[in-house]
């Protein structure tokens, strides 16, 4: 299911890097979140629960990430103009059932003021 543009601020710039915010409903207990740049998988994070409600977090394509009860943040550093692109949060929900996939995204504009190492 493609939902189109994120209806929240998806990109937060700081210190020459960007935090890409991927939100999900807090009812969701087990999921996989992928960050796509165009059609390429940049990062992923999978949260599962085992017996006794033990939480497991796994990444096949590791990026610096941060998990809260309703979002995953992926951090990209050393921004340059090549980072400008469409980015998508690809959420696969395992629990609660049924399995659902939803895609939200936006375009990352890179301005000179956001670059990490500007030439003086």
């Amino acid at each position: 299911e493609i939902n189109g543009s994120a209806n929240y601020e998806m990109f937060i710039f700081h210190n020459g890097g960007v935090q890409i915010l991927c939100k999900y409903p807090d009812i969701v207990q087990q999921f996989k979140m992928q960050l796509l740049k165009g059609g390429q998988i940049l990062c992923d994070l999978t949260k599962t629960k085992g017996s006794g409600n033990t939480v497991s977090i796994k990444s096949l394509k590791f990026c610096h990430s941060q998990l809260s009860n309703n979002s995953v943040s992926f951090f990209l550093y050393n921004l340059d103009h090549s980072h400008a692109n469409y980015y998508f949060c690809n959420l696969s929900i395992f629990d609660p059932p049924p399995f659902k996939v939803t895609l939200t995204g936006g375009y990352l504009h890179i301005y000179e003021s956001q670059l990490c190492c500007q030439l003086k």
Epitope: N7, Y24, D26, I27, N70, L91, I93, P97, P98, T102
Partner: antibody, heavy 125, light 108 residues
Framework: EVRLVESGGGLVQSGGSLRLSCAAS????????MHWVRQVTGKGLEWVSA???????YYSDSVKGRFTISREDARNSLYLQMSSLRAGDTAVYYC???????????????????WGQGTTVTVAS | EVVLTQFPATLSLSPGERATLSCRAS??????LAWFQQKPGQAPRLLIY???NRATGIPARFSGSGSGTDFTLTISSLEPEDFAVYYC??????????FGPGTRLEIK
Amino acid sequence: EVRLVESGGGLVQSGGSLRLSCAASEFIFNSYDMHWVRQVTGKGLEWVSAIGTAGDTYYSDSVKGRFTISREDARNSLYLQMSSLRAGDTAVYYCTGDRTVVRGVNYYYYGMDVWGQGTTVTVAS
Amino acid sequence: EVVLTQFPATLSLSPGERATLSCRASQNIRSYLAWFQQKPGQAPRLLIYGASNRATGIPARFSGSGSGTDFTLTISSLEPEDFAVYYCQQRISWPPITFGPGTRLEIK
């Protein structure tokens, strides 16, 4: 008019098999998660099985390993293959559909808003 | 498994009266509760989803409330066609999807 029409019910001996079908019309079948719910005469509703839009399947403990749910979106059809039938499986079987929509932080569940008229399965012991 | 309990089991009222039906869940299901009406020989009909949202075509006299574990279906002024069996149902903690045992609303 939105319609679900079940068929395939009937009388079968204990240990036998039946295949129930449900034909959908006038709604976007492939956007619905589909379920089978049964009801023994004079009793309450019991959920049996479900299949998601992605083909993921779910079963109640009482039918797991004996029943198989499937869907054919191109034909707007839902199926329930029932085997190793028992007297306790005797009931009216309804097919029904519901929708879940995820948008950002919102998780919307719209309820089982389409139902068939039911088909009767009788298992003779 | 989430167990749903409905009470009363039977409710005897007259047309024009207000009906209050209750459903209690064994654990927190937030607002993911639906109400159904079923008449003899017919399939169930969705009345309320998300605890308080009326389904398409359902008259305004039907309303739902509650969240967490305690839910209520209210029929503000009973019409003759409202006498039936009412079920609550949850589908957030599953499988299995569970239904309550039902409340029979009968004419006094």
